[in-house]
Interface confidence: low
């Protein structure tokens, strides 16, 4: 059982004597006066577990002590730290000759975790150790212990493990602690790619290429790679990914964006607090809702406020010039956050008696400079009938108006066409010829343009042609012309009269009175 | 003055089925949702749920899901749990309150009115 | 779920004494805490919101701190009818759960 020791991120311990709780038992060759398991006190007054061997007065020495086997965990190279002490032949008296201040470090690599024995010609020499100058005191009760450290590495391995071997030839040692580990890239998170736990290459100078996966909440912009140097060492990091909508950067993770606040696109953006007039209520809004009564239109950024329509337009003012009215107004007091503000023109044609019942005006009036997505805060309306009600709305629409289901945005007005000369009379009748009077009748122009106020009869003899003729005034619809020549030919015209003048005569109406006293009675438009 | 009224305190037995009333008043009932909220006795407060008043739609603990139902008349500002095959572990007082469904700047929630309570008694 | 651990579960105070009741969260709420008082038989009232604002009535004997995860409920002189049960409530993530009282006595 192994007692867990902080080591570097980096580094992954596969063997560490310090850490085996009790004793650790390796295979001493010669199995009795070479090297021996003793215990000792390190500055903690923990007991470690050591190996020391210390036959310096005897010539020919060749001790080995071996390791259990030592799984190698997909580790191509691995390293070799051994902690130890090792005595100054100078410090011991009368051992010239046979005394060294050396060790060989061996290894061998198996699949075989059970081997009971050293051979030594199996095992392939690292490196000869030697104490350098650069130790460590440590103090173990009373004594000093100088305490050197050594680090070797091996590799390429292949086998499932290995087994590592000390050979003293004649020195004074105590091995004190043998960790083994290997180097990996530990696990980690740049530009919001995760790179795994990744073991550092075969030789000291390779690269290990791999590619990070995005964290969650997150995707690729370029592909992430980055390259595991042999030290352990992340190195040049290439590509990145960056936060979903809805997420931003917090401490190396895309988190959710808080209430209030939004993001709309995978950018390296944070998180915006919601436009005015928006709000969210839910961890991760890619985008704000907007108030009641507030509205995005279709290409609204979604930074943008949510806005409303506008109110209706201002002082409407309307001006009638006979048949064309020039209205003008002013802008809405709120544009609802918008300036995408424009004017539509509604026309209603209403009934004197009823202005309820109001009708589309239709195709025949005409706006300048139109009707609708007027920009201006004015338009001329022509063609218009004469004497007719009219109710004109100016609605004010921006680019959230048709989101708006109540609108109210319009102001409207009402005016009367001015009168005008009323159209010509279509059709006049005699309807009674006798031999010095005749009858007429006619129907109320098409277009009045106003009140009729009197009607006009022009006749006379026809071979006069016109010459000479006479006038006759009435306020109905048909007159008796008296005093006529009989069997004459009389032509009539018949014309209307509204405030604003006459119209045009009617076309001709030819009649010829009779010689007999008795009435003809007659309909057509030339009667004789 | 803007008020949530409960229905009155409900004996039954197990197995029975209870529907709990809660109608709001002095306000835009659509303007916030309702919530439920379970006291046993003795016991402190337990948040059951939600439903959203404009659609209609509920939301439940993962405790009050399967026997729980939210529900609503819009036209009388009311809101309604129903409680199905009832045990007696059911015995507690069940509050509504209510949460503005529109948020105008504040991100913070509370719940700012409540309604006085139920009790619902399942003993057979 | 954040769970919300309230303590003391009960305390006994004299009228004029300084009362605090801390609310703990099982992670970073950012201040999405409210605070309730329940007397026996009625429902909870509303007493602050957002961890330190008072809602409206609510005397300024009563007043909130802390962030993160760290809550307190402070009243500065305990009235008589301040004898109730308190309880915090968080709204960081569904479900909302309430912290399980404090029973604040007569000494």
């Known amino acids: 059982v192994t007692g867990s020791r902080v080591y570097p991120a980096n580094e992954v311990t596969l063997l560490d004597s310090r850490s085996v709780q009790g004793e650790l038992g390796w295979i001493a060759s010669p199995l009795e006066g070479g090297w021996e398991e003793v215990s000792i006190m390190d500055e903690k007054n923990t007991p470690i577990r050591t190996y020391q061997v210390c036959n310096v007065m005897e010539p020919s020495q060749n001790n080995w002590l071996r390791t259990d086997w030592i799984t190698r965990e997909g580790a191509q190279r691995v390293y070799i730290e051994i902690k130890f002490t090792l005595r100054d032949c100078n410090s011991l008296p009368g051992v010239m000759g046979t005394c060294k201040e050396t060790f060989n470090l061996y290894y061998y690599e198996s699949d075989n975790d059970k081997e009971r024995f050293i051979r030594e010609n199996q095992f392939v020499k690292i490196d000869t150790i030697a104490a350098d100058e650069s130790f460590t005191q440590v103090d173990i009760g009373d004594r000093i212990m100088k305490l050197n450290t050594e680090i070797r590495d091996v590799g390429p391995l292949s086998k499932k493990g290995f087994y590592l071997a000390f050979q003293d030839v004649g020195a004074c040692i105590a091995l004190v602690s043998v960790r083994v580990f290997y180097k990996k890239c530990p696990l980690t998170v740049r530009n919001l790619a995760q790179f795994p736990d990744t073991i550092t290459g075969a030789d000291t100078s390779s690269l290990v290429e791999v590619r990070g996966s995005c964290v969650n909440n997150s995707e690729e912009k370029d592909v992430p790679k980055m390259y595991c140097g042999a030290d352990g060492e992340w190195l040049v990091p290439i590509g990145n990914c960056l936060c979903n909508a809805g997420h931003e950067e917090r401490s190396g993770e895309c988190q959710a964006c808080k209430i209030g606040y939004y993001k709309a696109l995978s950018t390296d953006a944070t998180c915006a607090k919601c436009p005015p007039h928006s709000y969210s209520v839910w961890e991760g809004a890619t985008s704000c809702t907007c108030d009641r009564g507030f509205f995005r239109a279709d290409n609204d950024a979604a930074s943008m406020p949510c806005t409303r329509p506008p109110s209706a337009p201002l002082n409407l003012i309307s001006n009638v010039n006979e048949t064309s009215v020039n209205l003008e107004w002013s802008s809405p007091q709120n544009t609802g956050g918008r300036q995408d503000i424009s004017y539509n023109v509604v026309c209603k044609k209403c009934g004197a008696g009823d202005p309820s019942k109001c009708r589309p005006c239709g195709s025949g009036v005409h706006y300048t400079p139109q009707q609708n997505g007027l920009k201006t805060t004015k338009v001329s309306i022509t063609d218009l009938l004469a004497h007719t009600n009219y109710t004109f709305e100016i609605w004010a629409v921006n680019g959230v108006s048709k989101y708006n289901p109540n609108p109210d945005q319009s102001v409207s007005v009402t005016v009367t066409t001015n009168q005008a000369a009323p159209s010509s009379i279509a059709l006049v009748q005699a309807k009674e010829v006798t031999r010095y009077s005749v009858a007429l009748a006619w129907l109320e122009p098409d277009r009045p343009n106003g009140v009729i106020l009197e009607y006009e009869v022009k006749y006379y003899e026809k071979d006069q042609n016109e010459r000479s003729y006479r006038i006759v005034r009435t306020a109905a619809r048909n007159t008796d012309i008296k005093g006529l020549n009989p069997l004459t030919s009389y032509v009539f015209h018949v014309r209307a009269r509204t405030a604003a003048g006459y119209g045009d005569f009617s076309e001709p109406l030819e009649v010829t009175t009779n010689t007999v006293p008795s009435r003809i009675i007659g309909d057509g438009a030339n009667s004789t | 003055q803007v008020q949530l009224v409960q229905s009155g305190s409900e004996l039954k037995k197990p197995g029975a089925s209870v529907k709990v009333s809660c109608k709001a008043s002095?306000?835009?009932?659509?303007?916030?949702?309702m919530h439920w909220v379970r006291q046993a006795p003795g016991q402190g407060l337990k948040w059951m749920g939600w439903?959203?008043?404009?659609?209609?739609?509920?939301t439940y603990a993962d405790d009050f899901k399967g026997r729980f139902v939210f529900s609503l008349d819009t036209s009388v500002s009311t809101a309604y749990l129903q409680i199905s095959s009832l045990k007696a572990e059911d015995t507690a007082v069940y509050y509504c309150a209510r949460i503005p469904l529109y948020y105008y700047g504040s991100r913070y929630w509370y719940f700012d009115v409540w309604g006085q309570g139920t009790t619902v008694t399942v003993s057979s | 779920d954040i769970q919300m651990t309230q303590s003391p579960s009960s305390l006994s105070a004299s009228v004029g004494d300084r009362v605090t009741i801390t609310c703990r969260a099982s992670?970073?709420?950012?201040?999405?805490l409210a605070w309730y008082q329940q007397k026996p038989g009625k429902a909870p009232q509303l007493l602050l919101y957002?961890?330190?604002n008072l809602a409206d009535g609510v005397p300024s004997r009563f007043s909130g701190s802390g962030s993160g995860t760290d809550y307190t409920l402070t009243i500065s002189s305990l009235q008589p009818e301040d004898f109730a049960t308190y309880y915090c409530q968080h709204f960081w993530g569904t479900p909302w759960t309430f912290g399980q009282g404090t029973k604040v006595e007569i000494k």
């Open positions: 002095g306000y835009t009932f659509t303007d916030y949702s």
């Open positions: 992670e970073n709420i950012y201040r999405n």
């Open positions: 957002a961890a330190t």
């Open positions: 439903i959203n008043t404009e659609t209609g739609e509920p």
